[in-house]
Interface confidence: low
């Protein structure tokens, strides 16, 4: 039977004087010579040597300084050996406790706690939980931390608590200010045995930013706002307000929104937030008129792009802000109603009766007062043919020369152009349209096709016909002989009701030629002017092209009529037409 | 009574515009937000942004920036809501609803923001 | 953006019995929410807003609570008309986002 006997040792010091430190004996001892032997943790295995054993009486030293934190209990297992080295005794188990000092301190989870809560957050608003843990033995005062603020900055009036115990940091009271204090930096000690004197501690950073909530209402910097603007203009910018929020900039809590509360019957204004400055733009986007509103006052209010935060949006009120606008007269000038004028030409006025025919008065009207305008000049603006002209001062409108009613100009019969008033005090201009009813010419006038044609040398001879919408059949064909003697050089001789053949009467040079020809129908009626046919000679090959390019891209024919090439703008327009050879 | 009655149903191909009306009366259109929300077959409901009448101002969801544009004509009471480039997806009910922003008689440290009162919709179908 | 969760997505029960629906916030949004009512083919209708105030009309058996994050709908005593598709929606910020739905069926 084993007689054993075990001491507790003290971490972190030299334990020899309490050697031994236990002592273990069999009672075999009495008839017989034992060895002891130990063996185990602190003695064969790492940490080794802390335990030696006297094998003859059994006590056992303790040689070596311990540390609770890395051994807190040596199993020292023992062996009576008889001298065969046989055991006498069951292996004994012999616990030797090693006692804890306080030699470790608390150790924060992190150095910098970071953390946020919102502004206005009601009292014992949990904000973070700080974790601090002690290596020493577990549930004992030695590993009891009490947690403590120890500063706040910004300091002044608490505004955080500590629970000593849990390490929850709460708010104090519903107090916190975003706009007084976006940050608190709290500065907590963790201490041992309870927060005791002689405990060991340690601090942490712990860094609270106030999140901001819509608990400032925007007001306008001012208390009244008026600007002046020119009538009929429209302004990007007529005035700036600038809006004050606390918020936090930027924010949709700080950013304004601008209304319009009254006075914009007419939507003349829009007001927009320029998201930089939070001012608010006011435009004028639709033109103001003097005569109709010559002061205009609106109120303005403002609110926030965020809905306000539920501790302050009863007492929220839209308080106006009076704007006054002055609208500017502003010398309107001219202007003409109707701003398109029709007009039309008699029936049967043409050639030299043109010259000077009054198509009517056309005037403007002074937009100050609605009457007639008296200091106007009239002119002619856009006037495609030059055909007209007006009188500066009653805005009567002529035609200033003759002009071919078949021109290009006239589209679907009309002739428009543009007649301008120019206000001799402010120059302002305005602009009317006039368009021109240019009666069709003679509808029994036939015209002859195609107009231009190449006839060879050797065969100078051409076919011409009269359109098939003329009506008044038989057709018949002569030469007129202006200037004299062209009608000797051509000769014209009807084929059937429509068609005659144009033939030279003498030999022809190279080079282009224009003989007018005057259809009659078969009731004696004509086209007003004779019609120009234009031939260009050339020498021909065997297939009646001509062998020059002078006339690429011009019908040329026999007098079968067949055609051999195609007619462009530009060629058929060939501009030294003359009345011989070229 | 007040209310909001919207423009009749449309049919669009794919990638052109739709324009949907909605009508207030009863009260002054520029009193109140407009929010527009649509509900495509089966599906919940989708907030697309709201108006401010008075100003103008918009706010859109994310997913429809670029291509909704919210307006209105106050002369007439009338918001509308322009979807462009458009795509079979966007086969849907759009509904204009009020938005306001409400006291609340138990708290009265309260304002909350809710939609009280919804056109009956228009139905817009995008196929090619 | 706001994620709204509601459940369940559907519902069966007969009338006269107490329904309750609830609506999940992705983050606190203190008692801005609202709860809409709506029947196939009809626009919405606003029941309750901020959490728990009933709508001027909205009878007395419909009821709402919760702050933060949790948020209920109850039904007292189920009626005929009250079969419908019922719709939570934040307005603590934009977009102003909606749940699923929860569909109320007739068992």
């Known amino acids: 039977e084993w007689i054993k006997f075990a001491a507790a040792c003290r971490e972190g010091e030299d334990n020899s004087k309490r050697n031994p430190i236990a002592k273990i004996r069999s009672d075999c001892e009495s008839n017989q010579k034992i060895t002891y032997r130990i063996s185990g943790v602190g003695i064969d295995r790492p940490p080794y040597g802390v335990f030696t054993i006297n094998p003859r009486t059994g006590e056992i030293n303790i040689t070596s300084v311990v540390d609770r934190e890395i051994t807190p209990l040596f199993l020292i297992y023992c062996r009576a050996l008889n001298s065969r080295g046989e055991d006498l005794e069951r292996p004994l188990e012999l616990r030797v406790k090693v006692m804890d000092i306080n030699d470790n301190a608390p150790v924060f989870s992190q150095s910098v706690y970071t953390a946020s809560i919102e502004e206005n957050s009601d009292a014992n608003t949990l904000v973070v939980k700080l974790c601090a843990t002690d290596a020493d033995e577990e549930n004992h005062l030695n590993s009891k931390i009490a947690y403590k603020i120890v500063s706040q900055e910004p300091s002044g009036a608490p505004m955080f608590i500590l629970n000593r115990y849990t390490g929850e940091v709460c708010t104090m009271s519903s107090f916190l200010d975003r706009e007084q204090h976006s940050m608190y930096n709290l500065v907590v000690r963790g201490s041992d045995r309870d927060g005791a004197a002689d405990g060991l501690s340690s601090e942490c950073d712990c860094r609270i930013k106030v999140l901001d909530v819509n608990d400032n209402f925007p007001t306008l910097e001012k208390t009244s706002y008026s600007a002046s603007i020119e009538e009929n203009c429209l302004s990007s910018e007529l005035i700036r307000l600038q809006a004050i929020d606390l918020d936090e900039e930027g924010t949709d809590n700080w950013l304004a929104q601008y209304l319009i509360l009254s006075g914009n019957d007419g939507n003349w204004f829009d007001i927009q937030t320029d998201p930089q400055t939070n001012e608010g733009i006011l435009k004028v986007v639709k033109m103001l008129d003097y005569e109709q509103a010559p002061n205009i006052q609106l109120s303005i209010g403002v609110k926030n792009q965020a809905d306000f935060h539920y501790s302050v949006a009863s007492q929220f009120q839209m308080h106006p802000t009076p704007v006054r606008i002055q609208v500017v007269d502003v010398r309107e000038g001219p202007a003409f109603h109707p701003s398109t004028m029709a007009f039309s030409v008699r029936e049967g006025i043409k050639g030299s009766s043109l010259l000077n025919y009054v198509l009517g008065t056309y005037t403007a009207i002074d937009l100050d007062t609605g009457n007639p305008a008296t200091d106007v000049r009239y002119i002619i603006g856009h006037d495609a043919g030059s055909w007209l002209k007006i009188d500066s001062r009653t805005g009567e409108i002529q035609f200033s020369r003759e002009f071919d009613k078949k021109s290009k100009y006239i589209i679907n019969g009309i002739y428009t152009a543009e007649i301008l008033a120019i206000d001799d005090g402010s120059g302002k201009t305005a602009t009317g349209t006039i368009c021109i009813e240019v009666p069709d010419i003679n509808d029994y006038c036939p015209n002859i096709f195609p107009e231009r044609r190449t006839i060879c040398i050797d065969s100078p001879s051409v076919l011409i016909s009269v359109n098939e919408h003329s009506y008044g059949s038989p057709f018949t064909f002569c030469v007129v002989d202006e200037p004299p003697g062209i009608a000797d050089m051509w000769d014209v001789r009807s084929t059937n009701a429509t068609s005659a053949i144009l033939t030279a009467k003498q030999v022809l040079s190279p080079g282009f030629y224009e003989i007018p020809i005057l259809v009659k129908d078969s009731y004696n009626r004509a086209c007003e002017l004779a019609q120009m046919v234009q031939l260009y000679a050339c020498d021909c090959d065997d297939n009646h092209m001509c062998l020059d390019s002078g006339a690429a891209g011009i019908y040329t024919e026999d007098i079968t009529g067949d055609t051999y090439g195609p007619v462009t703008e530009d060629q058929a327009g060939v501009s030294n037409v003359g009345l011989g050879p070229a | 009574q007040v209310q909001l009655v919207q423009s009749g149903a449309e049919v669009r191909k794919p990638g052109a515009s739709v324009r949907v009306s909605c009508k207030a009366s009863?009260?002054?259109?520029?009193?109140?937000?407009i929010n527009w929300v649509r509900q495509a077959t089966g599906q919940g409901l989708e907030w697309m942004g709201w108006?401010?009448?008075?100003?103008?101002?918009?706010a859109y969801a994310q997913k429809f920036q670029g291509r909704v544009t919210m307006t209105r004509n106050t002369s007439i009471s009338t918001a509308y809501m322009e979807l462009s480039s458009l795509r079979s997806e966007d086969t849907a009910v759009y509904y204009c609803a009020r938005g306001l922003f409400f006291g609340v008689v138990t708290k009265p440290n309260y304002y909350y923001y809710a939609m009280d009162v919804w056109g009956q919709g228009t139905t817009v179908t995008v196929s090619s | 953006e706001l994620q709204m969760t509601q459940s369940p997505s559907s519902l069966s029960a007969s009338v006269g019995d107490r329904v309750t629906i609830t609506c999940r916030a992705s983050?606190?949004?203190?008692?801005?929410l609202n709860w809409y009512q709506q029947k196939p083919g009809k626009a919405p209708k606003l029941l309750i807003y901020?959490?728990?105030s009933l709508q001027s009309g909205v009878p007395s058996r419909f009821s709402g609570s919760g702050s933060g994050t949790d948020f209920t709908l109850t039904i007292s005593s189920l009626q005929p008309e009250d079969f419908a598709t019922y719709y939570c929606q934040q307005s603590y910020s934009t977009p102003r986002t909606f749940g699923g739905g929860t569909k109320l069926e007739i068992k």
């Open positions: 983050q606190s949004i203190s008692s801005y």
């Open positions: 108006m401010n009448p008075t100003s103008g101002n918009t």
């Open positions: 901020a959490a728990s």
């Open positions: 009863g009260y002054t259109l520029t009193t109140y937000d």
